[in-house]
Amino acid sequence: RAPRCRELPAQKWWHTGALYRIGDLQAFQGHGAGNLAGLKGRLDYLSSLKVKGLVLGPIHKNQKDDVAQTDLLQIDPNFGSKEDFDSLLQSAKKKSIRVILDLTPNYRGENSWFSTQVDTVATKVKDALEFWLQAGVDGFQVRDIENLKDASSFLAEWQNITKGFSEDRLLIAGTNSSDLQQILSLLESNKDLLLTSSYLSDSGSTGEHTKSLVTQYLNATGNRWCSWSLSQARLLTSFLPAQLLRLYQLMLFTLPGTPVFSYGDEIGLDAAALPGQPMEAPVMLWDESSFPDIPGAVSANMTVKGQSEDPGSLLSLFRRLSDQRSKERSLLHGDFHAFSAGPGLFSYIRHWDQNERFLVVLNFGDVGLSAGLQASDLPASASLPAKADLLLSTQPGREEGSPLELERLKLEPHEGLLLRFPYAA
């Protein structure tokens, strides 16, 4: 008799793929545009990325550091009207893209949560949650919660409102903290909270360090659903050299949890390459005309248009990974086992019951390495085969679909491999 199938876990929409943050509408659209109507015109692009949710804004009225002139129910007229927002929501729903609204109150000011009148601000947030839930938004984000006094209790209250409206609604909190204990204390009192932090932001050094950060986090959070990003708002290029971007895309898409990206991460958007552009929100490079300030500063391979036409580009890799992440059971909700593969390497298996399994091997170093996969680290339920098929490499030149002998696996500098193999009884 065939073994019984393992019961599928309950999956919410944010479990099924990546979230895409657009914190600055004007920078995202460029060319002096930057409103909700224009964003509606970019939804097809978001669909092509196969992302499940759009984290938008803040877009509410906020006069810098002025509580009285901050209205979480009013859209800043520079971004459009309530009607524009409703129209964006409807269009996004038709394309199965969920909309998460950032309600960080004082986003233009010094302290995101104001330095006084905490209770008034918290009440305004509570009212705004109810208002926008009824408007049809799918969730909320609040950032810089380390600046919010009694953050845990406020988050618990806001979570109650969000989940009380529908279990299908999401609350994301963001913190600049990279300290695991601080992160855990925020998570402790809030069961379903998705938390973005700077926890992984200094992981770029070695495979061992990254492995230890990831496994510590997963062990500490138990069976909680996690999110993976390098910060609560900033681009990957703020933390990583260009040669590690592909590696991190592969890792973020294949760890157990929700990957969260900022606009431009899919093309390696880098403020440092665009003189005069702000680090936190450089202009999105749709094509070579997106940054007219310095003629010739932008080449085709830095843009969405150029990368869309190149199957070997970062954008093409992003699209492929996003597609795999949203349809393979083992990547959607599979178990995770990290194991030793040699110095400089981070490797792990994702598997779910009798479904196809995935092996990820990441070389963080700048020298080529032979992987010594220590299968003995793995439980019997996750044993390695002798060979696995190469689904994709972060570097060009490998023949995809070909079987690779795992005992003789060699990785190029900064190369990541995603391999697949069948379940064997």
């Epitope: 209205d71 309530k82 009440t123 305004k124 009212d127 705004a128 109810e130 009824q134």
Partner: nanobody, 125 residues
Amino acid sequence: QVQLVESGGGLVQAGGSLRLSCAASGRAFSSNGMGWFRQAPGKEREFVATISCSGTSTYYADSVKGRFTISRDNAKNTVYLQMNSLKPEDTAVYFCAADTRHCMGYTKDEGYAYWGQGTQVTVSS
């Protein structure tokens, strides 16, 4: 159960002012989001303004923004609509409504479980 009774309507010249009141009895008033809607002859009922249970947050229809002010007094179980710079197109029956599920009401009338009978406001030119 919540009972709502509006008052304060009447005939006024364009540019004039009126203050509508809505007295609530029954279920805990201070935990209800409250709203004002209006219906002109031959037209559908439309949203005017809403206020959160604490009175901290308010939201207005674009057509009345800057002219109308919604407020509430939880000690008196009453919500108000101060209407200034009235225009002939403000002529309608004004209804007060209570949302017993949300502390912050919304712009759609289906969210409101309890309604008053309405008070007529007529603005002549």
